[in-house]
């Protein structure tokens, strides 16, 4: 019941390579680097995009007062609200990580709370009543998690580095065509 907005600002979560699809280890023959028409542009982070805000999972910081009936916290608390788009949705040649990114549609990721923290707040009540202490659970960080075909949207799957392991018993194909052939080894990561 009682949350009064006080102020807010935003922080981008720039994904780390351990959390998101990583570029393949060998990039010498990567045509993204070597194509003349691209001016030999260097390899990009797989989720890098000119408009980061369009595709990043953002942490919006809200500073609020906690209220409980007539009582209000002595000091405001700062909480995060998770917002924004989770990739991958960028120009194809730089999306060299795992996953079948050449498809027109693919795994759906959502920006949702990752970690929570508990904070004790002191509530001041009117009419000279004694202050009350209360614990509130606040969002501490946000993360991109995948909607899976086996769960509903409330049960989201972590998109972490463990997803990079190739399917059990599957032989990696030879790297016949440079870095992009690495896609074959990682194509079942989703």
């Amino acid at each position: 019941q009682g949350w009064q907005a006080f102020k807010n600002d935003a922080t981008e979560i720039i994904p780390e390579l351990g959390e998101y699809p990583e570029p393949p280890p060998e990039l010498e023959n990567n045509k993204t680097m070597n194509r003349a028409e691209n001016g030999g542009r260097p390899p990009h982070h797989p989720f890098e995009t000119k408009d980061v805000s369009e595709y990043s999972c953002r942490e919006l910081h809200f500073t609020r007062y906690v209220t409980d009936g007539q009582c209000r916290s002595a000091k405001p608390v700062t909480e995060l609200v998770c917002s924004g788009q989770c990739g991958p949705a960028r120009l194809l040649p730089n999306a060299i990580g795992r996953g079948k990114w050449w498809r027109p549609s693919g795994p759906d990721f959502r920006c949702i709370p990752d970690r929570y923290r508990a904070q004790r707040v002191q509530l001041l009540c009117p009419g000279g009543a004694a202050p009350r202490a209360r614990k509130v659970r606040l969002v501490a960080s946000c993360k991109c998690k995948r909607l899976t075909r086996f769960h509903n949207q409330s049960e989201l799957k972590d998109f972490g580095p463990e997803a990079a392991r190739p399917q059990k018993g599957r032989k990696p194909r030879p790297r016949a065509r440079g870095a992009k052939a690495n896609q074959a080894e990682l194509e079942n990561a989703y």
């Epitope: 028409e37 194809l92 040649p93 990114w101 549609s105 899976t148 052939a181």
Partner: antibody, heavy 119, light 112 residues
Framework: EVQLVESGGGLVQPGRSLRLSCAAS????????LHWVRQAPGKGLEWVSG????????DYADSVKGRFTISRDNAKNSLYLQMNSLRVEDTALYYC????????????WGQGTTVTVSS | QSVLTQPPSASGTPGQRVTISCSGS????????VNWYQQLPGTAPKLLIY???QRPSGVPDRFSGSKSGTSASLAISGLQSEDEADYYC????????????FGGGTKLTVLG
């Protein structure tokens, strides 16, 4: 101007083969994944096949698997669809389409070429 | 029979807001992003919405997409006569080896 132009359609008997081509211009060809989508007369859209930057990045619809082969020639800015063992139900307008963005929909389309399979 | 289910028709008058639904399953809409296409009479399809709710440049903000669970919807506000077209939803389907599946299409008629 970004453009995809399909060719190679025509009238063919069941069981025969046909090869469709799609010529691209106005963009960096191998920045795009490319697809074939068909539309039977008076019906909806049906995805046929798609190919990424290279030949090991290929998908087919179940209805054409084993009969159709998609390929691309980046040097010629061209996409192909080799259609074998054609059936009457393959009769449709075949569109060439591309996506420049991973999981970002088909954002470039050609005007289509008509394939009629009839005896 | 299409894997994704859309109403065959929808209608509205100029200025109205119209919503087109698209129903799927856990193997397609439930776990993958949804795209929407517009096909004007006698022309090739055009991408309208990608990744559930993103508009390509040049698409008016009258068009918006949303997704919840195994269903998606396309909303068109401030309906205009030039919006009369067929609309298709599409998503990757993870069944078997997978394929890109379209809805059967919805013919939108702008009345009056």
């Amino acid at each position: 101007e970004v453009q995809l132009v399909e060719s190679g359609g025509g009238l063919v008997q069941p069981g025969r083969s046909l090869r469709l081509s799609c010529a691209a211009s106005g963009f960096t060809f191998d920045d795009y994944a490319l697809h074939w989508v068909r539309q039977a007369p008076g019906k909806g859209l049906e995805w046929v096949s798609g190919i990424g930057w290279e030949d090991d990045m290929i998908d087919y619809a179940d209805s054409v698997k084993g009969r159709f082969t998609i390929s691309r020639d980046n040097a010629k800015n061209s996409l192909y669809l080799q259609m074998n063992s054609l059936r009457v139900e393959d009769t449709a307008l075949y569109y060439c389409a591309g996506n420049s963005r991973g999981y970002g929909g088909l954002d470039v389309w050609g005007q289509g070429t008509t394939v009629t399979v009839s005896s | 029979q299409s894997v994704l289910t859309q109403p065959p028709s929808a209608s509205g008058t100029p200025g109205q807001r119209v919503t087109i639904s698209c129903s799927g399953s856990s193997s397609n809409i439930g776990g993958n992003t949804v795209n929407w296409y517009q096909q004007l009479p006698g022309t090739a399809p055009k991408l309208l919405i990608y990744s559930n709710n993103q508009r390509p440049s040049g698409v008016p903000d009258r068009f918006s997409g949303s997704k919840s669970g195994t269903s998606a919807s396309l909303a068109i506000s401030g309906l205009q006569s030039e919006d009369e077209a067929d609309y298709y939803c599409a998503a990757w389907d993870d069944s078997l080896e997978g394929s890109y599946v379209f809805g059967g299409g919805t013919k939108l008629t702008v009345l009056g």
